[in-house]
Interface confidence: low
């Protein structure tokens, strides 16, 4: 089976992880999407999901996680605000499409949160000021209870697109794989 790769992000407590999952509009715009954590030897656990059907640009907040699905751009934005050391772990974005198994991304996110503040370029010193800029009209969505056993034992089939070049070889209507665009501050 193809081995899933990981991208490691090291952030400080109080900062915000900001991930954008780039998906095929034609196929997945209204599909329910979710943010999952993967613990060693366990099934992926869904931490937050969009509504079903997913609503355009409508923030869904579950605790410190905010999901926003931008249908026009084929982007699911996932934010984990006010990061804590205990948030460290392995995460992934998935698209639900019952009764089929969820579609998963090829690069999982290995998040490492440490104490203290960083002033390095690419991290935002003022990120804690953004933590509370959450729209008041957020909703909580019920997530499907099932998770796919495949995520523990084998990787999904290899995408036809290069992970670092979203859509570079993607047909508008015939694609079943999704590609993640990682961003964080």
């Amino acid at each position: 089976a193809t081995k899933l790769t990981e991208e490691k992000y090291e952030l400080k407590e109080g900062q915000t992880l900001d991930v954008k999952c780039d998906y095929t509009l034609e196929k997945f715009a209204s599909s329910q999407k979710a943010w999952q954590i993967i613990r060693d030897g366990e099934m992926p656990k869904t931490l937050a999901c969009t509504e079903r059907p997913s609503k355009n640009s409508h923030p869904v907040q579950v605790g410190r996680i905010i999901l926003e699905d931008y249908h026009d751009h084929g982007l699911l934005r996932v934010r984990m605000v006010n990061l804590q050391v205990e948030d460290s772990g392995l995460y992934q974005c998935v698209i639900y499409q019952p009764p089929k198994e969820p579609h998963m991304l090829f690069d999982r996110i290995r998040l490492v949160v440490t104490k203290g503040f960083s002033g390095t370029p690419g991290s935002n010193e003022n990120s804690t000021q953004n933590v509370y800029k959450i729209p008041p009209t957020t909703t909580k969505a019920l997530c499907p209870l099932y998770t796919s056993p495949r995520t523990v034992t084998q990787a999904p089939p290899k995408s036809t697109a290069d992970v670092s070049t979203p859509d570079s070889e993607i047909n508008l209507t015939n694609v079943t794989d999704i590609i993640r665009v990682p961003v964080f501050n």
């Epitope: 900001d18 954008k20 780039d22 509009l25 034609e26 715009a29 209204s30 355009n56 931008y70 249908h71 026009d72 751009h73 084929g74 982007l75 690419g122 935002n124 953004n130 670092s164 070049t165 979203p166 859509d167 570079s168 993607i170 508008l172 665009v181 990682p182 961003v183 964080f184 501050n185």
Partner: antibody, heavy 121, light 113 residues
Framework: QLQLQESGPGLVKPSETLSLTCTVS??????????WGWIRQPPGKGLEWIGS???????YYNPSLKSRVTISVDTSKNQFSLKLSSVTAADTAVYYC?????????????WGQGTLVTVSS | DIVMTQSPDSLAVSLGERATINCKSS????????????LAWYQQKPGQPPKLLIY???TRESGVPDRFSGSGSGTDFTLTISSLQAEDVAVYYC?????????FGGGTKVEIK
């Protein structure tokens, strides 16, 4: 008013690396709403997309140039940069930096004035 | 890559007359899920960078005169200048942003007859 300004050498020798910097003023490059891109235009010809970057450093490169291109960002200076290695005369062009919207599938709404880079020995 | 083909290459129109530029994409840039065409139009005057005129195929950018309009869907698009003014002399480019890499048309040069 947002302004973008390209800077860098106007003459580069073949096989060397072209390096350009785009300085953004009138707005923060760290805004979570925008991507930033490089586009080039050979003299008398059309426009070609080179690549784009998010303030965090997440990049997209045109596959036709991917093996030679590096785009980076320096949020502390409100700048992003382009490096194009192993240049040839075919890389002679006006290089523009531009602001994009929130997502890869978006137009360029603010452009720098452009800088002409000539590849010649 | 999606190939964008513009026609004509150049166009000479009398002041006050209508100018029409065509752009054809090698595959559809319309997504049925949101019924949006991922196409933009730019104007480039000599010695200047391109200026955004139209996005989503027909939405005018803020500050663009209403004599500029965009139309079309799927693979065939048109930029129309309803009443050509002297300041409209420029090269016009279409660009698709449905699939990366973004690609531009070859440009149409608009001159005064």
């Amino acid at each position: 008013q947002l302004q973008l300004q390209e800077s860098g050498p106007g003459l580069v020798k073949p096989s060397e690396t072209l390096s350009l910097t785009c300085t953004v003023s009138g707005g923060s490059i760290s805004s979570s709403s925008y991507y930033w891109g490089w586009i080039r235009q050979p003299p008398g010809k059309g426009l070609e997309w080179i690549g784009s970057i998010y303030y965090s450093g997440s990049t997209y490169y045109n596959p036709s140039l991917k093996s030679r291109v590096t785009i980076s960002v320096d949020t502390s200076k409100n700048q992003f940069s382009l490096k194009l290695s192993s240049v040839t005369a075919a890389d002679t062009a006006v290089y523009y930096c531009a602001r994009l919207g929130d997502g890869y599938r978006i137009w360029a709404d603010y452009w720098g004035q452009g800088t002409l880079v000539t590849v010649s020995s | 890559d999606i190939v964008m083909t513009q026609s004509p290459d150049s166009l000479a129109v009398s002041l006050g007359e209508r100018a029409t530029i065509n752009c054809k994409s090698s595959q559809s840039v319309l997504y049925s899920s949101n019924n949006k065409n991922y196409l933009a139009w730019y104007q480039q005057k000599p010695g200047q960078p391109p200026k955004l005129l139209i996005y989503w195929a027909s939405t005018r950018e803020s500050g663009v005169p209403d004599r500029f309009s965009g139309s079309g869907s799927g693979t065939d698009f048109t930029l129309t200048i309803s009443s050509l003014q002297a300041e409209d002399v420029a090269v016009y480019y279409c660009q698709q942003y449905a699939l990366t890499p973004y690609t531009f048309g070859g440009g149409t040069k608009v001159e005064i007859k």
